[in-house]
């Protein structure tokens, strides 16, 4: 029977700069029941606080709701593991909410084959930003990436769309069924997961010629 091993805070993520969650990996338990607590203070502050919500983020997590989240502060946090034989502390982690944003995937992905009479046909892709992100405030710039591939192909073709929420693709294989997905990331932060795939059948008469 031993004191617990050193825990590690390995990830903090925010969907929208308004809330965030951090997760830790427990160290060894020393063969005894072990309690974990996360404490934090903010930059320029010596007042120590405890995790406000150990439930929302699941096991070994701390969730900071809206009223606990400040974009303008760096959070300095550590996890304490305690059993009957003693305690151990994680390293301190410095968290700036601005840099841990991982949005939800974009929504309402729509894909359509357009075949104008006077121009080359193209694939038209359109989507909406994730609901939790309020782009009107100016706090966010979201960048988008599209990937697509024929259903049976192994390799994805990736297109960077910048801040646009629609995109045209000209070079496609006629007669093929394509999978299309889109994801987004803030200017500082992490890519979202890919949106659920949308399938589109490219007509056989779709021509790539000039």
């Amino acid at each position: 029977q031993l004191p617990p091993g050193k825990p590690e805070i390995f990830k903090c993520r925010s969907p929208n700069k308004e809330t965030f969650t951090c997760w830790w990996r427990p160290g060894t338990d020393g063969g005894l029941p072990t309690n974990y607590s996360l404490t934090y203070h903010r930059e320029g502050e010596t007042l120590m606080h405890e995790c406000p919500d150990y439930i929302t983020g699941g096991p070994n997590s701390c969730h900071f709701g809206k009223q606990y989240t400040s974009m303008w502060r760096t959070y300095i946090m550590m996890v304490n593991a305690t059993n009957q034989m003693g305690s151990s502390f994680s390293d301190e982690l410095y968290v700036d909410v601005t840099y841990i944003v991982q949005p939800d995937p974009p929504l309402e992905l729509a894909v359509e084959v357009k075949q104008p009479e006077d121009r080359k046909p193209y694939l038209w892709i359109k989507w909406s930003p994730p609901t939790l992100i309020d782009l009107k405030t100016g706090w966010f710039t979201l960048l988008y990436e599209i990937r697509l591939k024929p259903e049976k192909a192994a390799e994805w073709e990736i297109h960077f769309a910048g801040q646009q929420t629609e995109f045209k693709i000209l070079s496609l294989h006629p007669g093929q069924k394509y999978l299309v997905q889109v994801r987004c990331k803030p200017d500082h932060g992490y890519w979202s997961a890919w949106s659920p795939a949308t399938f589109i059948q490219i007509p056989s008469d779709f021509t790539m010629n000039d």
Epitope: E45, T46, L47, E50, Q67
Partner: antibody, heavy 118, light 107 residues
């Protein structure tokens, strides 16, 4: 409605003890850090004590250290201040106040009056 | 401990006047500063947090500014209902010190 209601104030003699209570309603009490703040008659506000959400961390103003003890019972949604060795300069209206998530007193009770006099 | 010094301790101004109250910290407190209003016989109410963030429901004639050691609360156009004592308070470390208060009266 978010509310804090203090009780337990009284007239006591110097050296005596008193226990103040504050009952919370309308919010998740166990998620919030709580404080006692006092105001002597005709004077300004003075922070007295702080307790973290689980009760594991406590802070006191120097003038009450060793005499006052802050505690909480999250199951009862209650905050307490055990006041021992009371002195005349402890005479004040005692407020309990909630600390919001960014460390500001956002909700205050109406206060309970403590008078220490012989 | 960090001391908070408010000035003036009292002031008298006319309705419509611009009123400024200052608060000085004896050490850098970043912008961990709040302003409270306490009307006679009432409980203190939070006006401003983080030196300049106006609380919901507080009239826009109130504003806060400053960072570090020097902070101000401004009432752009004093109204009769603004008769109160105003307190600054730092909240970056214990003790969570209040300033001495500024009593605002109408001439």
């Amino acid at each position: 409605e978010v509310q804090l209601v203090e009780s337990g104030g009284d007239l006591v003699q110097p050296g005596e003890s008193l226990r103040l209570s504050c009952t919370a309603s309308g919010f998740t009490f166990n998620s919030y850090e709580m404080n006692w703040v006092r105001q002597a008659p005709g004077k300004g506000l003075e922070w007295v004590s702080y307790i973290s959400s689980s009760g594991g961390t406590k802070y006191y103003v120097d003038s009450v250290k060793g005499r006052f003890t802050i505690s909480r019972d999250n199951a009862k949604k209650s905050l307490y201040l055990q006041m021992n060795s009371l002195r005349a300069d402890d005479t004040a209206l005692y407020y309990c106040a909630r600390l919001n998530g960014v460390d500001v007193f956002d909700i205050w009770g109406q206060g309970t009056m403590v008078t220490v006099s012989s | 401990d960090i001391q908070m010094t408010q000035s003036p301790s009292s002031l008298s101004a006319s309705v419509g006047d611009r009123v400024t109250i200052t608060c000085r910290a004896s050490q850098d407190i970043f912008n961990y500063l709040a302003w409270f209003q306490q009307k006679p016989g009432k409980v203190p109410e939070l006006l401003i947090s983080a030196a300049s963030t106006l609380q919901s429901g507080v009239p826009s004639r109130f504003s806060g500014s400053g960072s570090g050691t020097y902070f101000t609360l401004t009432i752009s156009s004093l109204q009769p209902e603004d008769i109160a004592t105003y307190y600054c308070q730092r909240y970056n470390s214990a003790p969570l010190t209040f300033g001495g208060g500024t009593k605002v009266e109408i001439k």
